[in-house]
């Protein structure tokens, strides 16, 4: 996260008109003092002295943890996933007790054939990762299994996974309707009982960048927001430059307070600046007003 570089000036004046010396400390910010041994340091906002410097808690930084960062690191997962709990009834295999033992040759063979069959069924779904048999039971063989889906994180990941789960439902319904026994014989890799196909549960990865941003911003949660760049979420305050929500302080420095972002205007040798965005410049010598 980029911190705003302070402007090199004699003083900064807030947009309300008061002169504030740098580095500025927002008087509304809660102040705590951290003491380690006989070393007393003014580490504010929950920061602690490590013997050399203040270790600041998010979202603070600075020598005394008095300033608020302009952006907070939020790290969405690289990939997001969904797990569908399904049940199908395989009629081309008769149940035997050995199928309950996951280390038996029967189970291993069934698992291999079932996995092959499902890989064929779901071959057109880019999010499809594989299947995992959780339980086999009598009737001919009732197969309780998970279908695993995965996709790269994007802001639209939920829609992508929701769509994929719908395609899984369509495809499993189709194959279990088409691949059925004829004259007690199966000509397909596996045959199914059409009525035995059920979707028991769907679990989708929950990740909300807005929620993570708000949590990390703590008492500044109302002023930090999420903006996207190249499908990646950024948790920023208006003081972070280069975003749609960025505040333009023109001739001044943006600073966060508990009332939101404000501009601290520059006073130079020739001008002083005022206004909410420090865009009103007054020349000192001629008292001439520029816009």
């Amino acid at each position: 996260p980029l911190a705003t570089i302070p402007v090199s000036t004699t003083s900064l004046t807030s947009s309300e008109g008061s002169t504030i010396s740098t580095p500025s400390v927002d008087i509304s910010t809660p102040v705590t003092t951290s003491i380690v041994g006989d070393q007393c340091s003014r580490c504010k906002n929950g920061g602690f002295w490590d013997g050399l410097k203040c270790q600041c808690l998010t979202p603070y930084y600075g020598e005394s943890c008095e300033e608020v960062v302009n952006s907070i690191d939020i790290a969405p997962p690289e990939t997001v996933s969904a797990q569908m709990e399904l049940t199908v009834t395989v009629t081309s295999v008769k149940f035997t007790d050995e199928l309950k033992n996951h280390s038996s040759q029967e189970f291993r063979e069934f698992n291999k054939t079932f996995t092959e069959q499902m890989n064929i069924v779901y071959s057109g779904i880019p999010e499809y990762v594989g299947v995992n048999i959780t339980n086999l039971r009598l009737g001919s063989v009732v197969v309780e299994h998970d279908v695993l889906l995965r996709t790269k994180y994007t802001p639209e990941y939920k829609t992508a996974l929701d769509n994929a789960t719908e395609v899984v439902k369509q495809k499993i319904t189709k194959v279990t309707t088409e691949q059925i026994m004829t004259n007690d014989n199966c000509s397909a890799l596996m045959c199914f009982n059409t009525t035995g196909t059920q979707v028991q549960n769907i679990t989708v990865t929950q990740y909300d960048p807005v929620e993570e941003c708000r949590q990390k911003a703590e008492e500044y949660e109302d002023y930090f927001l999420v903006e996207y760049r190249d499908q990646k979420p950024y948790c920023i305050s208006p003081c972070e430059s280069g975003f749609n929500a960025s505040k333009n302080c023109n001739h001044g420095k943006c600073q966060m307070s508990q009332n939101g972002a404000r501009c601290l205007c520059v006073t130079t040798e020739t001008h002083w600046y005022s206004g909410e965005d420090c865009n009103q410049g007054t020349q000192k010598s001629h008292h001439h007003h520029h816009h």
Partner: nanobody, 123 residues
Framework: EVQLVESGGGLVQPGGSLRLSCAAS????????MSWFRQAPGKEREGVAI???????GYADSVKGRFTISQDNAKNSLYLQMNSLRAEDTAVYYC?????????????????WGQGTMVTVSS
């Protein structure tokens, strides 16, 4: 390790009979299934007959009433008695085994295979 070895193939006249055998090792006949498949030149492998440890037998429509599948558990052997043979029965005949009690004559459903024995029906 499952090993299957077929024998009994050869040249026979149309209308004649032939008995194929398959000796199995590493496989128990009292569990799972065994089957016969065949592959004619330039064609896909197709199911001929199947027998399961629960006593169930199944046949392809093209051989029903002419072929009989059987097994001898004591000898760990599988047999295919082929009667009223036709020219279209000419193929390499394969023995296949599965630890599952199968009802499938799709070759992809079978995991263990023999090398095959050639049956030629010609006058």
């Amino acid at each position: 390790e499952v090993q299957l070895v077929e024998s009994g193939g050869g040249l026979v006249q149309p209308g004649g009979s032939l008995r194929l055998s398959c000796a199995a090792s590493g496989f128990t006949f009292s569990r799972g299934s065994m089957s016969w498949f065949r592959q004619a030149p330039g064609k896909e492998r197709e199911g001929v007959a199947i027998i399961s440890s629960d006593g169930w037998t199944g046949y392809a429509d093209s051989v029903k009433g002419r072929f009989t599948i059987s097994q001898d558990n004591a000898k760990n052997s599988l047999y295919l008695q082929m009667n009223s043979l036709r020219a279209e029965d000419t193929a390499v005949y394969y023995c296949a085994a599965s630890f599952l009690v199968l009802r499938a004559l799709n070759p992809k459903a079978w995991h263990y295979w023999g090398q095959g024995t050639m049956v030629t029906v010609s006058s």
